[in-house]
């Protein structure tokens, strides 16, 4: 009685269960009653990452330097190449097919998380007591100057974009 279903890592063809090809190999010829499935390793620039019956291996991803990409991890016969972005750039999507420059945090905002090759800069508003007066992809919000520790007094209040201005205390006559 011909099978209607096959075991794991097998496939049904012409009423027969054949072994799938292991990761890193492609199908050359289905099995017969007499012969095992014929598989062939993927070439150097190709891969297959699952047990399969593919007759063609997939091309490794190309990390195009013109798009700001560089190789993070070289592909093998079983894995695809992983691309990342050059310094100062990050991926536009999870699949990292192109890169864009990291955004800077505007004055009044500081860097919460510095950008990586795969994620953009995360900015946060400077809370009370902190400020940022520059547009930067690296600088965090800085605390207002403590006039008191310098034996000075606040002459001008700080904002999220400006530091306090300290001045000498008025001397009592």
């Amino acid at each position: 009685e011909p099978p209607t279903a096959c075991r794991e890592k097998q496939y049904l063809i012409n009423s027969q269960c054949c072994s799938l090809c292991q990761p890193g190999q492609k199908l050359v010829s289905d099995c017969t009653e007499f012969t095992e499935t014929e598989c062939l390793p993927c070439s150097e620039s190709e891969f297959l990452d699952t047990w399969n019956r593919e007759t063609r291996c997939h091309q490794h991803k190309y990390c195009d330097p013109n798009l700001g990409l560089q190789v993070q991890q070289k592909g093998t016969s079983e894995t695809d190449t992983i691309c990342t972005c050059e310094e100062g750039l990050h991926c536009t999507s999870e699949s990292c097919e192109s890169c864009v420059p990291h955004r800077s945090c505007l004055p009044g905002f500081g860097v919460k998380q510095i950008a990586t090759g795969v994620s953009d800069t995360i900015c946060e508003p400077c809370p009370v007591g902190f400020f940022s007066n520059v547009s930067s992809a690296f600088e965090k919000c800085r605390p207002w100057t403590s006039c008191e520790t310098k034996d000075l007094v606040v002459q001008q209040a700080g904002t999220n974009k400006t530091d306090v201005v300290c001045g000498p205390q008025d001397r009592q006559r």
Epitope: N14, C31, T32, E33, F34, T35, E36
Partner: antibody
Framework: QVQLVESGGGVVQPGRSLRLSCAAS????????MHWVRQAPGKGLEWVAV????????YYADSVKGRFTISRDNSKNTLYLQMNSLRAEDTAVYYC??????????WGQGTMVTVSS | EIVLTQSPGTLSLSPGERATLSCRAS???????LAWYQQKPGQAPRLLIY???SRATGIPDRFSGSGSGTDFTLTISRLEPEDFAVYYC??????????FGGGTKVEIK
């Protein structure tokens, strides 16, 4: 490279025996089924027998059933055809061929068997 | 047993001409398991076409196969001097036996 080489042919009297061998190289012999196919002088191809890669399945043409036995030794990468009770009509070139789902993709050069008194 | 009948028995043609060889089965054959072989004098057969229409590795594209069911055809679009040989069809769907056709000889006219 992938190669099959037959040997063991010769002239033999009717009723006698002969054993043909087929030496395989250049591929994983133990993964492939193997066939014997013969060709009488001036005639077409006639399939003789097949054996599976693990030797558990064997089939024969009606014309040789009960007289011929196909076998293999995977440790020696060799296929055999034991031919008993030979008849004049068994005179032919005997080829071994590799089994695939694409047909017989590799053939040996053949060995001549002549059954004559 | 599936009987394969090839026609014509002999085909006399000149180089550059088109050759059309026929193989007819006594009952329906799965096209996945119909092959064509070429054999030259003193040589072993060589696999040309498998699965009725797929060319084997290294076979020039002037060779093509077609057909299904009981009627199959091997076509050589433009005969080259090295194509003059005997051609056999074979079915390996229904066995035993694995059956061959009687062959078609393509000779120089």
């Amino acid at each position: 490279q992938v190669q099959l080489v037959e040997s063991g042919g010769g002239v033999v009297q009717p009723g006698r025996s002969l054993r043909l061998s087929c030496a395989a190289s250049g591929f994983t012999f133990s993964s492939y089924g193997m066939h014997w196919v013969r060709q009488a002088p001036g005639k077409g191809l006639e399939w003789v027998a097949v054996i599976s890669y693990h030797a558990s399945s064997k089939y024969y043409a009606d014309s040789v059933k009960g007289r011929f036995t196909i076998s293999r030794d995977n440790s020696k990468n060799t296929l055999y055809l034991q031919m008993n009770s030979l008849r004049a009509e068994d005179t032919a070139v005997y080829y071994c061929a590799r089994d695939t789902s694409r047909g017989h993709d590799i053939w040996g050069q053949g060995t001549m068997v002549t059954v004559s008194s | 047993e599936i009987v394969l009948t090839q026609s014509p028995g002999t085909l006399s043609l000149s180089p550059g001409e088109r050759a059309t060889l026929s193989c007819r089965a006594s009952q329906s054959v799965s096209s996945s398991y119909l092959a064509w072989y070429q054999q030259k004098p003193g040589q072993a057969p060589r696999l040309l076409i498998y699965g009725a229409s797929s060319r084997a590795t290294g076979i020039p594209d002037r060779f093509s196969g077609s057909g299904s069911g009981t009627d199959f055809t091997l076509t050589i679009s433009r005969l080259e001097p090295e194509d003059f040989a005997v051609y056999y069809c074979q079915q390996y769907a229904d066995y035993p036996p694995f059956t061959f056709g009687g062959g078609t000889k393509v000779e120089i006219k």
